[in-house]
């Protein structure tokens, strides 16, 4: 069976939507008016991992992009990047654990761990115009918490 | 209102360099990625490459080592830098914002283009 | 190294008449594809964007259809103000591109 995707935009606890920042690169900023359909659209696919009540494992594409949110190790140290992919290939059910993050839903907002590496999680500076990256704390300085809004296919 | 305009076009000998600005107005470099065009006489449109919101460039595949696209986002202004220019590379230049609508890369608007003739 | 084939290179045409002009990806670009109408001496200027959504201000006689890998650009009844060049734009990916442009296609005066 093919794997079930939505699409959708992500906005962090400050409201910072997420865009393009380069070929391989999302950053967050506050954006009003018609930059707002400058927003990142996610392709977010429902994957084979673990799963609980609270905790859904899903991948992150760029709609109509061969892009995906991944994790991987750089300079020993676990990082988000945007990896290209063949579209022959994806998405698929079972996908590779740096490209399967754990929804975990708490009061309505949105935390994405890494399969990867457990703990890790999605996250955004309070500064403005930084770059989205994978972040060891929860709770902290970094923003971990988002929102998610349904985007019409 | 949404401006850009180039300017920096002219006559330039082979060899030589050249820098183009490209003047923005009524939007954020930090929000929008841009992106140069070039049009030799009586050609089609041929795209020369990106400057990203975040700063790094992406280049077109024949473009990579002569042509350098940089921006001040201060002065709000993009530029492509041209170096050992040719007699081929005479062409009107443009800059354009580029619209990510649902990730997919749309130009809108487009300056009204300079004019560079490579010419002993 | 995704590349966009534009057919035909021109047409003649009369007022009133229905003009197609089609384009091809060389791989599936989706509904990443835009079409933009340059007059001599004049900037380009956005027609259609994501395959088929007409761009502000542009009349309701353009229309763009496709997805994957062919698309067409059709003026249902063409104008004294419609003879120009029109171009297609791939906007899915800009690593190892020679060209995100089609060649383009004149419509000329019959």
């Known amino acids: 069976a093919p794997v079930r995707s939505l699409h959708c935009t992500l906005r962090d606890a400050q409201l910072k939507s997420l865009v393009m920042s380069g070929p391989y690169e999302l950053k967050a900023l506050h954006l009003q008016g018609q930059d707002l359909e400058q927003q990142v659209v996610f392709s977010m696919s429902f994957v084979q991992g673990e799963e609980s009540n609270d905790k859904i494992p899903v991948a992150l594409g760029l709609k109509a992009k061969n892009l995906y949110l991944s994790c991987v190790l750089k300079d020993d140290k676990p990082t988000l990047q945007l990896e290209s992919v063949d579209p022959k290939n994806y998405p698929k059910k079972k996908m590779e654990k740096r490209f399967v993050f754990n929804k975990i839903e708490i009061n309505n907002k949105l935390e994405f761990e890494s399969a990867q590496f457990p703990n890790w999680y999605i996250s955004t500076s309070q500064a403005e115009n930084m770059p989205v990256f994978l972040g060891g704390t929860r709770g902290g300085q970094d923003i971990t918490d988002f929102t998610m809004q349904f985007v019409s296919s | 209102e949404v401006q850009l305009v180039e300017s920096g076009g002219g006559l330039v000998q082979p060899g030589g360099s050249l820098r183009l600005s490209c003047a923005v107005s009524?939007?954020?470099?930090?929000?929008?990625?841009m992106t140069w065009v070039r049009q030799a006489p009586g050609k089609g449109l041929e795209w020369i490459g990106y400057?990203?919101?975040?700063?790094?460039?992406s280049y077109a595949s024949w473009a990579k080592g002569r042509f350098t696209i940089s921006k001040d986002s201060s002065k709000n202004t993009v530029y492509l830098q041209i170096n050992s220019l040719r007699a081929e590379d005479t062409a009107v230049y443009f800059c354009?914002?580029?619209?990510?609508?649902?990730?997919?890369?749309?130009?809108?608007?487009w300056g009204p283009g300079t004019l560079v003739t490579v010419s002993s | 190294d995704i590349q966009m084939t534009q057919s035909p290179s021109s047409v003649s045409a009369s007022v009133g008449d229905r003009v197609t002009i089609k384009c091809q990806a060389s791989?599936?670009?989706?509904?990443?594809l835009a079409w933009y109408q340059q007059k001599p001496g004049k900037r380009p200027k956005l027609l259609i964007y994501?395959?088929?959504t007409l761009a502000s201000g542009v009349p309701s006689r353009f229309s763009g259809s496709g997805s994957g890998t062919d698309f067409t650009l059709t003026i249902s009844s063409l104008q004294p103000e419609d003879f120009a060049t029109y171009y297609c734009?791939?906007?899915?990916?800009?690593?190892?591109?020679?060209?995100?442009f089609g060649g383009g296609t004149k419509v000329e005066i019959k």
């Open positions: 354009a914002r580029v619209k990510m609508i649902s990730n997919i890369e749309t130009f809108d608007p």
């Open positions: 009524g939007f954020s470099l930090d929000v929008y990625t």
């Open positions: 400057i990203w919101s975040g700063g790094s460039a």
């Open positions: 791989e599936r670009i989706y509904s990443g």
């Open positions: 994501r395959a088929s």
């Open positions: 734009q791939q906007g899915v990916s800009s690593s190892d591109i020679d060209n995100v």
